[in-house]
Interface confidence: low
């Protein structure tokens, strides 16, 4: 059964997917697709990475974490009701039938007038995009109105801040996580 994630119309939706590279930068190709994971590949691909970089993405879909450390969580910007459905995160591990497949269900609700909020297990919020500068001290974040010409590797969100702040050198497991190697 799919893990369910929720967002409201107009928010950014967050669909977590992780793997732990055998070594930093030793990446495994990943694809994200709309629809349940088929036997091979992803159907209706919205984003893809290869061994080095993000090599394909479509409007409104981006990786908000450090995919070079295995964080291939998908962010969908400014969601509409039409974005509801199953999404497939496929970790394309070399070898026959070795792929790890994760089906994540996104439920979009109509925007409502700010009631007292309740934190969900799969809390999905419209965090503002953040430009993150990492140093030895606490990460500094600057909220941006827009991100014209910013490299994908620079893009982060508060969600990524939260994960990175726990352990600088360890990846968290999540609803969709595997270790490689």
């Amino acid at each position: 059964s799919e893990v369910e994630y929720r967002a409201e119309v107009g928010q950014n939706a967050y669909l977590p997917c992780f793997y732990t590279p055998a070594a930093p930068g030793n990446l495994v190709p990943v694809c994200w697709g709309k629809g349940a994971c088929p036997v091979f590949e992803c159907g209706n691909v919205v984003l893809r990475t290869d061994e080095r970089d993000v090599n394909y993405w479509t409007s409104r879909y981006w990786l908000n974490g450090d995919f070079r450390k295995g964080d291939v969580s998908l962010t969908i910007e400014n969601v509409t009701l039409a974005d509801s459905g199953i999404y497939c995160c496929r970790i394309q591990i070399p070898g026959i039938m070795n792929d790890e497949k994760f089906n994540l269900k996104l439920v979009i609700k109509p925007a409502k007038v700010t009631p007292a909020p309740t934190r969900q297990r799969d809390f999905t919020a419209a965090f503002p995009r953040m430009l993150t500068t990492r140093g030895h001290g606490p990460a500094e974040t600057q909220t941006l109105g827009s991100l014209p010409d910013i490299n994908l590797t620079q893009i982060s969100t508060l969600a990524n801040e939260l994960r990175d702040s726990r352990l600088a050198n360890d990846l968290r497991d999540s609803g969709a996580t595997i270790r490689i190697g």
Partner: antibody
Framework: EVQLVESGGGLVQPGGSLRLSCAAS????????IHWVRQAPGKGLEWVAD????????EYADSVKDRFTISADTSKNTAYLQMNSLRAEDTAVYYC??????????????WGQGTLVTVSS | DIQMTQSPSSLSASVGDRVTITCRAS??????VAWYQQKPGKAPKLLIY???FLYSGVPSRFSGSRSGTDFTLTISSLQPEDFATYYC?????????FGQGTKVEIK
């Protein structure tokens, strides 16, 4: 250095109220979840409530719902637990702990020293 | 609510022993399980998060694993400072729930 310090515990009569504070230092509570976990004398751990101050999300255990209120003041980097209509079974050491906004990563990596709440006539 | 059934409730062991504590979730909790150590009069300390990840500063003799809804904490070679009570916790759904604890005592 990350630190959580609870205060406000004490002896209170059944039906009475107490307000516990959890003062955080070394991190911004607005980026995390703050939990209250209690431990009755000689018993195990029981989650009570949590808040993600940055978003204002709150959750409660059924046993305290409608009696306890969790809140936070990000300007003071402090979380609170307002406990009303206290019962004998609320007697416990109350700990605040730091967790994470996303439930899947929400184990508690820093804990306060605890504050004892005794409900007795 | 998800029940976390922890066993044994107590055990006696000697320094150098290999110790295994198990926790069974009443339903799927994915990898959202943590293990804590608590000594008398002290707050719990995080040992393992996300079922198998060793928390920073925790000795490598501690390890965690998952098999379906069964979770295991292993201490490969028990040290004097390891005598304490250990709790598992699931944080997959609200409310987060703890196991009842396992007290590790000196034989």
């Amino acid at each position: 250095e990350v630190q959580l310090v609870e205060s406000g515990g004490g002896l209170v009569q059944p039906g009475g109220s107490l307000r516990l504070s959890c003062a955080a230092s070394g991190f911004n509570i607005g980026n995390y979840a703050i939990h209250w976990v209690r431990q009755a004398p000689g018993k195990g751990l029981e989650w009570v409530a949590d808040i993600t101050p940055g978003q204002g999300y709150t959750e409660y255990a059924d046993s305290v719902k409608d009696r306890f209120t969790i809140s936070a003041d990000t300007s003071k980097n402090t979380a609170y637990l307002q406990m009303n209509s206290l019962r004998a079974e609320d007697t416990a050491v109350y700990y605040c702990a730091r967790g994470y906004v996303y439930r899947m990563w929400d184990s508690y990596d820093y804990w306060g020293q605890g504050t004892l709440v005794t409900v007795s006539s | 609510d998800i029940q976390m059934t922890q066993s044994p409730s107590s055990l006696s062991a000697s320094v150098g022993d290999r110790v295994t504590i198990t926790c069974r979730a009443s339903q799927d909790v994915n990898t959202a399980v943590a293990w804590y150590q608590q000594k008398p009069g002290k707050a719990p300390k995080l040992l393992i998060y996300s079922a198998s990840f060793l928390y920073s500063g925790v000795p490598s003799r501690f390890s965690g694993s998952r098999s379906g809804t069964d979770f295991t904490l292993t201490i490969s070679s028990l040290q004097p400072e390891d005598f304490a009570t250990y709790y598992c916790q699931q944080h997959y759904t609200t409310p987060p729930t703890f196991g009842q604890g396992t007290k590790v005592e000196i034989k």
